[in-house]
Interface confidence: low
């Protein structure tokens, strides 16, 4: 640890005196003290001499000697008082900035330790301190205001009693800053606005912060609007509110509105869009195709997006047929609001039955009128197949009827032996029927096709199979000729019942 000579904690001298402070350490040493005039510094290896031959009140302060090379960071200090009868205070800083709840040191150093008993801290012009100000005094350091509050941001003077009169220091401005977590919080209401020309509208931009020092403005497109600001303070936050009231909107009021607030921490902004329309509107749309195909037994959700202003006065889902007069159960209809002017309406159709194919219409009404959006729902079925033996124009013919949706295509197979289903090893011949005759093809119903296979003579130890398939599945029917006639065989696995 370095050693200071003279080896006293405090030194009291008169103005104009010569002061020599010597510091000796094991290695090189450094002096640190208040910035003041007239000091000269002389260093010689492990010692350093700080001296002045004309001490002034401004030399009052604590001088510390440190040894930079010392791993323990030891230091020694001496406090110098230059007792000037005309200058009881040496003010080291005229502005002190702290955050709320920190201790604020007002660095007015007493130049004469004898005056300590008569010191006080006042606000400028001799005003008393604010109530609840908790402070302490150190002749070496000055006055400390403990746990400073924002409201204590004032100009202070240190007062000393000299010969029965109070002598003030120059003023020290204390700035107590709020601990600001970030830019002001913002709200812009509404998030979106639509009005018919001539209607009234209101847009409210509000910002809040723990500190009053922030700015807020509302701009339309890129023009800052001159709106009177309402200020408030509640829940320990300052609030600034800008309210734009438009009695009769016109097209020039439309566009983008931005609420912008800024403070020392930065800027926040939020925007909304204001649409001005000539008249009421009601638009229905769907992201889905209006023509839907679903496999029987599966489920489907029909979704309609509604954009409307003014709001809807009524809406419902309707089944338009053709199978029955049943109507969708209300519990299966669901409405969700995306925002003020956009809504999504969903109709859930679980485990679809054949009788539920057909047209579903969503109807909605507002002052702009009625609108409807209709979905066409067709059910998909795997093919059902049947084969019969008949004579057409005197020729023996196998007649295969296949029914399903989408329209099934048909393939005939002839294979050796008697079997429920031909396998590759047994196949003797294959005939594709690219154009089977369509027997029935009504909307929302299965398509029934018919394929004819003319057979001159039925081979008795063989099987004739009609296979039909579509995108949903396949079906087949095996025809086995027997001497007593013909035996038809649907495959065991084909037990589909819709």
């Amino acid at each position: 640890i370095p050693v200071i000579e003279p080896s006293v904690p405090e030194l009291v001298v008169k103005p104009g005196a010569t002061v020599t402070l010597r510091c000796v350490g094991n290695g090189s040493v450094e002096w640190d003290g208040p910035p003041s005039p007239h000091w000269t510094l002389y260093s010689d290896g492990s010692s350093s001499i700080l001296s002045t031959n004309n001490a002034t009140f401004q030399n009052t302060g604590t001088y510390r000697c440190t040894e930079p090379g010392d791993p323990l960071g030891g230091s020694a200090a001496i406090h110098l008082y230059v007792k000037d009868p005309a200058r009881p205070w040496n003010v080291l800083a005229q502005e002190v900035v702290v955050f709320e709840d920190q201790d604020a040191l007002l660095p007015c150093l007493l130049t004469d330790p004898v005056l300590e008993a008569g010191v006080s801290l006042v606000r400028v012009r001799g005003r008393p301190l604010m109530r609840h100000t908790n402070y302490s005094f150190s002749p070496w350091h000055g006055f400390t205001i403990h746990r400073a509050k924002f409201i204590q941001s004032q100009d202070y003077q240190c007062s000393a009693l000299m010969g029965g009169r109070k002598v003030m220091s120059i003023s020290i401005r204390l700035k107590v800053q709020k601990v600001i977590p970030g830019p002001p919080a913002l709200t812009l209401v509404p998030a979106e606005l639509v009005r018919i020309r001539g209607e009234a509208a209101q847009i409210v931009c509000s910002a809040s912060s723990v500190d009053v020092n922030f700015d807020v403005f509302l701009q339309h497109n890129n023009t800052k609007l001159a709106i009177p600001q309402q200020s408030d303070f509640h829940n320990n936050r300052y609030q600034k509110v800008l309210t734009l009231n438009l009695d009769q909107v016109d097209f020039q009021h439309a566009g983008n509105y931005s609420c912008v607030a800024s403070n020392v921490q930065g800027k926040h902004s939020t925007s909304m869009f204001f649409r001005v329309v000539e008249s009421a509107y009601l638009n229905l749309s769907s992201e889905q195709n209006l023509i839907q195909e679903v496999t029987v037994g599966e489920g489907l959700n029909l979704k309609v997006m509604v954009e409307a202003y003014p709001g809807l006065q009524g809406f419902n889902w309707t089944y338009l047929g053709p199978f029955s007069d049943h109507q969708p159960e209300p519990k299966l209809a669901n409405a969700t609001t995306k925002d003020t002017y956009r809504h999504t309406f969903t109709l859930s159709l679980p485990r679809l039955k054949p009788s539920e194919a057909g047209r579903y219409s969503f109807l909605a009404r507002n002052p702009g009128g009625w609108r409807a959006l209709t979905f066409e729902l067709t059910l998909r079925y795997p093919p059902e197949v049947s084969v019969i033996w008949t004579f057409i124009n005197g020729s023996g013919t196998l007649l295969c009827a296949a029914s399903g949706y989408p329209q099934p295509n048909v393939t005939w197979l002839q294979c050796s032996g008697h079997t429920d289903r031909c396998d590759e090893a047994q196949v003797l011949q294959v005939w594709d029927d690219p154009y089977p005759e369509v027997l029935s093809q009504e909307p929302f119903h299965k398509v029934t096709v018919q394929s004819l296979l003319t057979v001159e003579t039925l081979e008795h130890n063989q099987t004739y199979e009609c296979r039909a398939h579509n995108s949903v599945g396949s079906g087949s029917w095996a025809f086995i000729p027997i001497s007593a006639g013909a035996h038809t065989h649907p495959p065991d696995e084909f037990l589909f019942t819709p």
């Epitope: 005229q94 400028v124 012009r125 005003r127 008393p128 004032q154 100009d155 120059i170 003023s171 401005r173």
Partner: antibody, heavy 126, light 106 residues
Framework: EVQLVESGGGLVKPGGSLRLSCAAS????????MSWVRQAPGKGLEWVGR??????????DYAAPVKGRFTISRDDSKNTLYLQMNSLKTEDTAVYYC?????????????????WGQGTTVTVSS | DIQMTQSPSSLSASVGDRVTITCQAS??????LNWYQHKPGKAPKLLIY???NLETGVPSRFSGSGSGTDFTFTISSLQPEDIATYYC????????FGGGTKVEIK
């Protein structure tokens, strides 16, 4: 006699600048805290800002509407107070008064704005 | 900033009437309040300083009272030369004027 005389008012366009002066006499100007106060047409008195004496740090304070646009300075050697007004707005149109806020004369200290100039008119208009 | 709310904004009274004007501060300002008289075309005049002290040369019919947040200015017997606008002003933290009270004679 304690006296304040303002000058420098006039007509200026929005966004323009103007510098007002206030010549002081009859008291120790260097010890005084000086303020500017204005009165817009049909409105009340509004404090603009102040400058403290050099012995009290010579610091300045401003009212919110003018902060960042107006600058108060002093030349103690000329016993003169100044108000530099930049980025002027139409709402800055007013009669501007220079006034003492706190000053010493003959060993007695006076608090309150008891010395006022006659006022100088500033008109901001396009 | 400290706000000063002055009321009424205007009043009409007869010569010899007692006139009272109130001023309310948005926070405690101790007694750091002045009252001024302002006549058209003239510079304002300090009447009362530190809430209740009468400025030298001001007639004794003018008086002030109050401390903290509520202050009162009184003209005990209104005279024709008292027609003016009166302002309160705080100097506890920066300076703020009240909105003014215009006094007229009936």
């Amino acid at each position: 006699e304690v006296q304040l005389v303002e000058s420098g008012g006039g007509l200026v366009k929005p966004g323009g600048s103007l510098r007002l002066s206030c010549a002081a006499s009859g008291f120790t100007f260097s010890n005084a805290w000086m303020s500017w106060v204005r009165q817009a047409p049909g409105k009340g008195l509004e404090w603009v800002g102040r400058i403290k004496s050099k012995t009290d740090g010579g610091t300045t304070d401003y009212a919110a509407p003018v902060k960042g646009r107006f600058t108060i300075s002093r030349d103690d050697s000329k016993n003169t107070l100044y108000l530099q007004m930049n980025s002027l707005k139409t709402e800055d149109t007013a009669v501007y008064y220079c006034t003492t806020e706190y000053y010493g004369s003959g060993g007695v200290w006076y608090y309150g704005m008891d010395v006022w100039g006659q006022g100088t008119t500033v008109t901001v208009s396009s | 900033d400290i706000q000063m709310t002055q009321s009424p904004s205007s009043l009409s009274a007869s010569v010899g009437d007692r006139v009272t004007i109130t001023c309310q501060a948005s926070q405690d300002i101790s007694n750091y309040l002045n009252w001024y008289q302002h006549k058209p075309g003239k510079a304002p005049k300090l009447l009362i300083y530190d809430a209740s002290n009468l400025e030298t040369g001001v007639p004794s019919r003018f008086s002030g009272s109050g401390s903290g947040t509520d202050f009162t200015f009184t003209i005990s017997s209104l005279q024709p030369e008292d027609i003016a606008t009166y302002y309160c002003q705080q100097y506890d933290n920066l300076l703020t004027f009240g909105g003014g009270t215009k006094v007229e004679i009936k």
